[in-house]
């Protein structure tokens, strides 16, 4: 059976934060259909998202197995209504993704400050530990608990009443920053992982300033 | 006050696999530590082997990567050292190490405070 | 890897005296992850000083770090009969984390 009706994806295209992780490829299916294989780490391939139209299949639930092993994937093509179609050398068409390592590469989802506190001169800024979709005997693992102290913290913060910015680092989720006294101050940290080539820096946290609901006051 | 404490057989035969334990006393090895093993040549400087947090997630020295495995069993608050195909250049003291945050600058950094005593591993036929 | 270098290799000096120790690491690290340790024989290492100036609890004011980038050090005003030991600087910013080849600080 030929495939006259089929072509190639192309555009192969992982999409990954935080470790839910997606693969995307092109074009949009005309009479054709796709199915995702993804190699394990015994180089076997596994099917995923058989027979389906859309152009990405999630792919989470394989790569949080060995967030640290690199994977490949490749997307069969279809005649529609006819998976079971092979090409004249008795093989669908497929294209080959990238490889694709999670711990170096998934992206670094924006944080989120989950509170701040002062007392006298001093605010405790504390950043959410964002859980993730890896799991290790039956519980989920936050970011910290995967990264470890590959992942650091940078704050960014300044007084509401001017623009100069000062920064703190941290390898842990907690932030402990002088300030003076009566002045009300705004916070956003970034997460980083400066040991990367790609893929360093998440985007800034939304910013939250002193004042608001967020957080709390303690002479 | 966390004490630890290495444990293992002084004597290993070159070519098999070096296997030590360190237990940690007097606090939860799941408190938002790491912890580390470190080793000390004969008559000479320390060298990190490698380090573990609770969760299992670890960092080794790429010098010894392909032969390292460090593990933690939280329910017996211990740590484990496993270097395989050891020859006599293995032959060290072997200290077990807890990284706590440190306050500097704003933030936490880690740094090995608490030190096992230390226990020597000698590797011969 | 970083490496750290420390000299003089053996310092010999007199109880009282003040003791300088020099470590200058290969390429630059961060004040945050620079530590020292003092060693004595048959004894594991202790941690006196953390963030290139920061003294580890119950450390005595007689021991200070300073340093950035690439030279740090280790300086005891008054030498005490305890102080005689190895000391060791460590550098834990940069996989794999590594120690100097120590200092040895010895009775003249």
């Known amino acids: 059976s030929g495939t006259t009706n089929t072509v190639a994806a192309y555009n192969l295209t992982w999409k990954s934060t935080n470790f839910k992780t997606i693969l995307e490829w092109e074009p949009k299916p005309v009479n054709q259909v796709y199915t995702v294989q993804i190699s394990d780490r015994s180089r076997n391939w596994k099917y995923k998202c058989t027979g389906t139209t859309d152009t990405e299949c999630d792919l989470t639930d394989e790569i949080v197995k060995d967030v640290n092993w690199t994977y490949e994937a490749r997307v069969l093509s279809y005649p529609a209504g006819n998976v079971e179609s092979t090409g004249s050398a008795g093989e669908p068409l497929y294209e080959n993704s990238p490889e694709f390592t999670p711990y170096l590469e998934t992206n670094l989802g924006q944080p989120t400050i989950q509170s701040f506190e002062q007392v006298g001169t001093k605010v405790n800024v504390t950043v959410e530990d964002e859980r993730t979709l890896v799991r290790r005997n039956n519980t989920f693992l936050s970011l910290r608990d995967v990264f470890g102290k590959d992942l650091i913290y940078t704050l960014y913060y300044w007084k509401s009443s001017s623009s100069g910015k000062k920064t703190a680092k941290t390898n842990t989720n907690e932030f402990l920053i002088d300030v003076d006294k009566g002045e009300n101050y705004c916070f956003s940290v970034q997460a980083v992982i400066p040991s990367r080539t790609v893929n360093r820096k998440s985007t800034d946290s939304p910013v939250e300033c002193m004042g608001q609901e967020k957080g709390e006051f303690r002479e | 006050q966390v004490q630890l404490q290495e444990s293992g057989p002084g004597l290993v035969k070159p070519s098999q696999t070096l296997s030590l334990t360190c237990t940690v006393s007097?606090?939860?090895?799941?408190?938002?530590?790491?912890w580390s093993w470190i080793r000390q040549h004969p008559g000479k400087g320390l060298e990190w082997i490698g380090e573990?947090?609770?969760?299992?997630?670890?960092r080794y020295n790429p010098s010894l990567k392909s032969r390292v495995t460090i593990s933690v069993d939280t329910s017996k608050n211990q740590f484990s050292l496993k270097l395989s195909s050891v020859t006599a250049a293995d032959t060290a003291v072997y200290y077990c190490?807890?990284?706590?945050?440190?306050?500097?600058?704003?933030?936490?950094?880690?740094?090995?405070?608490?030190w096992g005593k230390g226990t020597t591993v000698t590797v011969s036929s | 890897e970083i490496v750290l270098t420390q000299s003089p290799g053996t310092l010999s000096l007199s109880p009282g005296e003040r003791a300088t120790l020099s470590c200058r690491a290969s390429?630059?690290?961060?004040?945050?992850?620079l530590a020292w340790y003092q060693q004595k024989p048959g004894q594991a290492p202790r941690l006196l000083i953390y963030?290139?100036?920061s003294r580890a609890t119950g450390i005595p004011d007689r021991f200070s770090g300073s340093g950035s980038g690439t030279d740090f050090t280790l300086t005891i005003s008054r030498l005490e009969p305890e102080d005689f030991a190895v000391y060791y600087c460590?550098?834990?910013?940069?996989?794999?984390?590594?120690f100097g080849g120590g200092t040895k600080v010895e009775i003249k």
């Open positions: 573990i947090y609770y969760s299992g997630s670890t």
């Open positions: 007097g606090g939860s090895i799941s408190s938002g530590q790491y």
């Open positions: 963030g290139a100036s």
């Open positions: 460590q550098q834990v910013g940069v996989v794999p984390y590594t």
């Open positions: 190490a807890r990284d706590t945050p440190y306050y500097y600058d704003g933030g936490y950094y880690y740094y090995m405070d608490v």
């Open positions: 390429q630059s690290v961060s004040s945050s992850y």
